[in-house]
């Protein structure tokens, strides 16, 4: 039994880090493997993660962590019984994938303006709380070509757009994701999408 693709890990910079790797053949990850992780400092405890299958030869482990601080560094040991398959380290602050934003809502009651709001996925004391920027994806359910991305580079979790920039009388969906430039994070997963029917008063045209 060998590791084909070494574990790569990302942290939500709050409570979970997720490590994924591939074995050289079909593996029952939960029965055959254990990932031990330990914060590097005196008297820290070793924790054991039982991996789950992620495809035939793929494994994934969710590592529970206390509030992350930038200095945190973990040793990782992947075991198959008594055999050490791989040894590495992981610094959560250097491999951040933010949590996905939540509670995406489209407010259509403002005259001819769409207001999209969502929730910051971090509590106010978390470092990422004041460092997230967002991308909002809006697309038409009727027309696959009607697909647009709005970059929200300010901190407020909201976006205003004129309803007239979208077609009237059809349904649209929106979703949002986040990233933090300060930690050079990857993008978060997309939030669950929300749907609304876009309608607005067409301006009177004179011929």
């Amino acid at each position: 039994m060998k590791v084909l693709q070494e574990p790569t890990c990302v942290s939500d910079y709050m409570s979970i880090s997720t490590c994924e790797w591939d074995m050289n053949g079909p593996t029952n990850c939960s029965t055959e493997l254990r990932l031990l992780y330990q914060l590097v400092f005196l008297l820290s405890e070793a924790h054991t993660c039982i991996p789950e299958n992620n495809g035939g030869a793929g494994c994934v482990c969710h590592l529970l962590m206390d509030d992350v601080v930038s200095a945190d560094n973990y040793t990782l040991d992947l075991w198959a019984g008594q055999q050490l398959l791989w040894k590495g380290s992981f610094k959560p602050s250097e491999h951040v994938k933010p949590r996905a934003p939540g509670n995406l809502t489209v407010h259509t009651n403002v005259s001819d303006t769409l207001l999209l709001t969502w929730s910051n996925p971090y509590p106010p004391d978390n470092y990422l709380y004041n460092h997230l920027t967002y991308a909002v994806n809006i697309w038409s359910e009727n027309d696959p070509a009607d697909f647009r991305i709005y970059n929200v580079t300010y901190l407020e979790p909201s976006l205003r757009i004129a309803a007239s920039t979208l077609k009237s009388g059809i349904s649209y969906r929106a979703r949002v994701r986040a990233w933090a430039q300060c930690y050079n994070t990857t993008w978060s997963e997309w939030s669950p999408s929300t749907k609304w029917h876009n309608s607005y008063r067409e301006p009177f045209e004179q011929h």
């Epitope: 005196l42 008297l43 969710h62 206390d66 509030d67 996925p121 004391d125 997963e189």
Partner: antibody, heavy 115, light 107 residues
Framework: QVQLVESGGGLVQPGGSLRLSCVAS????????MNWVRQAPGKGLEWVSY????????YYADSVKGRFTISRDNAKNSLYLQMNSLRDEDTAVYYC????????WGQGTLVTVSS | DIQMTQSPSAMSASVGDRVTITCRAS??????LAWFQQKPGKVPTRLIY???SLQSGVPSRFSGSGSGTEFTLTISSLQPEDFATYYC?????????FGQGTKVEIK
Amino acid sequence: QVQLVESGGGLVQPGGSLRLSCVASGFTFSHSSMNWVRQAPGKGLEWVSYISRATGAVYYADSVKGRFTISRDNAKNSLYLQMNSLRDEDTAVYYCAREPVFDYWGQGTLVTVSS
Amino acid sequence: DIQMTQSPSAMSASVGDRVTITCRASQDISNYLAWFQQKPGKVPTRLIYAASSLQSGVPSRFSGSGSGTEFTLTISSLQPEDFATYYCLQWSSYPRTFGQGTKVEIK
């Protein structure tokens, strides 16, 4: 091994105050965020409060906000819960529980609020 | 605040039965969900975290699934020591909230 021992519970009248303590051993207390969780007699679990190891930030359940204060003394390996303006509905066993996500619990201390 | 609704609140089952408990969140919590077991007079112990990750030392007959708002705890073959009360917990945001509990009793 990890151990959490609560104390300070007892009988108190409505409107009164109590200070609960939780002494930790077997791990580096200053590196752990901590919680208080309570359980009224015959009822379910209710999270009460949290204090971060990283920032010292604190959070409270709506039911205790403004009345309870969580604090810690890393030099004494101790977690505290100052409970003021106690009500009948605060009667419960109070547990301290360690992060991440309540991996270790104390045995609890009983707080009875009654006239 | 996020509400966690567990069902059923109580159930009777026999040794060897497959038992399923569900937990519904009032809004999306991704996989930030844990399951705890509590026996009478004892302290709760964590069985599952991150919705589906088995806590080390917990028997493999326990499993968790779900994401978003719908979650399930399954005991594949109920054992005598599994008769207890089970709680779900969301830690996606503060205040953290538990489900009201499911008591699994002997039929």
